[in-house]
Structure formats: C-alpha cells, structure tokens
C-alpha cells in the first residue's frame, strides 16, 4: 500500500484565545502532508488547510460562525506527492481531536487597562473591551458583546508604597474605586467567567500606576 510511510497525527490540541482558534498536532511531517476537517456535532465536514506540511491549522473562521456550538476536527495524513492514496480500509489515516466548545473553552486574553482618571477620592478605571473575530452584521464583536454578563472583571489595587491589595469586581468594563487623596495607587485587572469550569480566568493585565501617562487627575 502507498500509505506504509504515513503516520496518523497525534496530540491534537486546541489553542484558542478570545476565539482566535488554532488546531495543533504532531508529528512534524516526513514524506507526508495533512488536511484538516471540522464539523459541528450535527453538521457536515468542511476541509481546511489542504495538503499542508504545517502542524497547525487556523480554524477561527469556522468556529466564529457559532461560538456556542461544539466542534470536532480531524487530521488526515497523506503520502507526499500521492495524496490520492488511501489506507487499507480505503480511506486515508486520520485522527480525531477532542471536542471543543469555543464559548466555554476559549482562553480569555490578557486584558489591558485602557484609562484611569482620578477625581478627588475616586478613581475611575476602564478596562479595554477587546475586539474578537466573532462577527455580527459585518462588524467584529467585542469580548463583552459576546459574553455579556457571563464576563466580569476583577481589579486588584494597592497603595504604591505598600503591598496589601484590595479588590473590586464589575459586570461592566468600569470600576470606581475609593482612594486616599494625594496617595499614588497601582492596579491590574483580570477577566473572569465565573460560570466556567475550565479557563475561568485570564492572565493579569500589565500593572498601571497613578502618575503614569494613562492617568488623569482632577481635583
């Protein structure tokens, strides 16, 4: 058979952040190429990344069509230069991926503190509403647009001169925290989806401190 030198893909892994979704697998090909197929549980298979020597395939365009669906992918192995060749069962070797539900599993990207403004003893902190690759009516939706109230943010803040952190939470992208007048504070934010069982939290945003460029002070 022409498939004696082909090996099935293995370690199929979904890598997804803010719905940017790539399927990765092994091994690096030697005298073989791969094609990926993806489908929903009830849908038809759609082929992507035809006869590639890569060991990854960007499936974002497919999963953003409905991020609440559950997807399955499979990776076919073909002999290089003889892609019509099939295995002993009459079809090429392939391996299935784990199931993947983007809405429940995509990693939350690192948030960014967009701005902060002090007015007296209050500081308004705004977290940037990251754009995703999910579309509706020809526009890209933000993380908030997609997750709605399932997404909260936690703000950790502390006096620059001490280490004791306080926290605030919000169902929007804004905080309004109490501070001492004339005292500098630092803070970072974290995105959280409390209802999830996996990938509940993002990594921490970069730390911002009052007195830096993003800040604004008003008496």
């Amino acid at each position: 058979s022409g498939t004696t030198n082909t090996v099935a893909a293995y370690n199929l892994t979904w890598k997804s952040t803010n719905f940017k979704t790539i399927l990765e697998w092994e091994p690096k090909p030697v005298n073989q190429v791969y094609t990926v197929q993806i489908s929903t549980k009830s849908g038809d298979w759609k082929s992507k990344c035809f006869y590639t020597t890569d060991t990854e395939c960007d499936l974002t365009d497919e999963i953003v069509k409905d991020v609440k669906q559950t997807y399955l992918a499979r990776v076919f192995s073909y002999p290089a230069g003889n892609v019509e060749s099939t295995g002993s069962a009459g079809e090429p070797l392939y391996e299935n991926s784990p199931e993947f539900t983007p809405y429940l599993e995509t990693n939350l990207g690192q948030p960014t503190i967009q701005s902060f403004e002090q007015v007296g003893t209050k500081v308004n902190v705004t977290v940037e509403d990251e754009r995703t690759l999910v579309r509706r009516n020809n526009t890209f939706l933000s993380l908030r647009d997609v997750f709605g109230k399932d997404l909260i943010y936690t703000l950790y803040y502390w006096k620059s001169s001490s280490s004791g952190k306080k926290t605030a939470k919000t169902n929007t992208n804004e905080f309004l925290i109490d501070v001492e007048k004339g005292v500098s504070y630092c803070f970072f934010a974290q995105a959280v989806i409390p209802s999830r069982t996996v990938n509940r939290k993002s990594t921490d945003s970069p730390v911002e401190c009052m007195g830096q460029e993003k800040g604004e002070f008003r008496e």
Partner: antibody, heavy 125, light 108 residues
C-alpha cells in the same frame, strides 16, 4: 426617560408559539444595557425568562431554554420573546424590563430598573 | 438554582409601624447581586434596593436593606399608606436569576 411597552396577542392556542415584542422609547436599545423578559403566573410570584444584549448575546432560564428565543432588532429599538409549544401553564402576565448598570462596591452591577406595564397572555383553545 | 425563601408570607401591620421582611437564600449570594422590588396590584414591580443595601434614586429613606451571604432583610422603618404592597427579593448573580415568593404587607 426610557419607557417599555409590551405588545402581542393576548390569546394563544396550546402547542402554538407565543410571540411578544417590547418597544423601547426614550433611549437606545444599544446603549449598554440588557433587556429582559419576566413573567408572573396569576396570583403568583415572578419568574425570570431570559435576557439579551444589543449584540445578541443571550442568557436563558434553563427550565425554559429549550422553548425560548429572545432576539433584538436595533433598527426598530425592539426586542422580542418567542415561547414555543405553549400550554395552559404558560398563562401569565409577561413583562419586559431594562437591566441597567448601577454602582456598588467599586464596580457596576445590573438591576431591572425600568419595567413595561405587562401584557396578559392566556393559553387556551 | 438558588432558591430564595421570603418570610413571613403576609405581614399585617398598621401605618406608622415598622416592617421587617426576611429573604433567605439556599446558598450564598454575593450582595452585589441582591435586589428588592415592590409590586402593587395591577402594576409592574419597582426597584427599591440594589446591592442588598443601596436605595434606588427616589426611594424614601424609610426603606433600608441589609444582610449578606444567605440572609437578607428589608426594613420599612415607619409604614406609610402607600407602602402596603408585595415585596420580592431577587438574586441576579447566578443563572437562572430568581425571585423570592414575596411578602405581602397588608393593613391590619
């Protein structure tokens, strides 16, 4: 000042689909609030049905999820409720409400602060 | 589902008296998501208290909310004639959002 008005048939036959629309006036449906449906069975308490954001993001009560669809039409400043396969147990006053952010404890949380007057829907043949 | 149990079911009091309404949750509720509503016959509910203790704009200061975890209380310090109504607690932190069964405050 934002006002909400429910509209739709007051009588629906069993097994059919109940369809209601809520028209938002005095404000934009796209202004960062959520929009909810709640019902109240005769002489009983309140039951949350579900909510929608202008982007189309939805949350539903799991007990009704298989029968409920909430949609939004930003061009008409309206959102709608569809409840399929209705029975007499779906007879109730149906309210639409705005879920707006209020400051509390360092952050902002959503509460239903503006309600429609409610519309009575009877399921009967 | 978080079950909110309100007690008493009915409270019979006279104008000028103090009303204490209880709301107990089947599991801990973040105070940020706890609200109280007032409903009069033939009307939609009206938001009174949010964040367990913060009065909505325009709500008289005779209404106050307190509590945390699983036990929350709405107090009306001195009942006015217009306060006789049904009061509901609600949690909006966990889907499905749920309401208590209501406490009817009626004129004695």
């Amino acid at each position: 000042q934002v006002q909400l008005q429910e509209s739709g048939p007051g009588l629906v036959k069993p097994s059919q689909t109940l369809s209601l629309t809520c028209t938002v006036s005095g404000g934009s449906i796209s202004s960062g609030q959520y929009w909810s449906w709640i019902r109240q069975h005769p002489g009983k308490g309140l039951e949350w049905i579900g909510e929608i954001y202008y982007s189309g993001s939805t949350r539903y009560n799991p007990s009704l999820k298989s029968r409920v669809t909430i949609s939004v039409d930003t061009s008409k400043n309206q959102f709608s409720l569809k409840l399929s396969s209705v029975t007499a147990a779906d007879t109730a006053v149906y309210y639409c409400a705005r879920d707006a952010p209020y400051y509390y404890g360092g952050g902002y949380y959503y509460y239903m602060d503006v309600w429609g007057k409610g519309t009575t829907v009877t399921v009967s043949s | 589902e978080i079950v909110l149990t309100q007690s008493p079911g009915t409270l019979s009091l006279s104008p000028g008296e103090r009303a204490t309404l209880s709301c107990r949750a089947s599991e801990s509720v973040d105070s940020s998501y706890l609200a109280w509503y007032q409903q009069k016959p033939g009307q939609a509910p009206r938001l009174l208290i949010y964040g367990a203790s913060t009065r909505q704009t325009g709500i008289p200061d005779r209404f106050s909310g307190s509590g945390s975890g699983t036990d929350f209380t709405l107090t009306i310090s001195r009942l006015e004639p217009e306060d006789f109504a049904v009061y509901y607690c609600q949690q909006a932190g966990v889907v499905p959002y749920t309401f208590g069964g209501g406490t009817k405050v009626e004129i004695k």
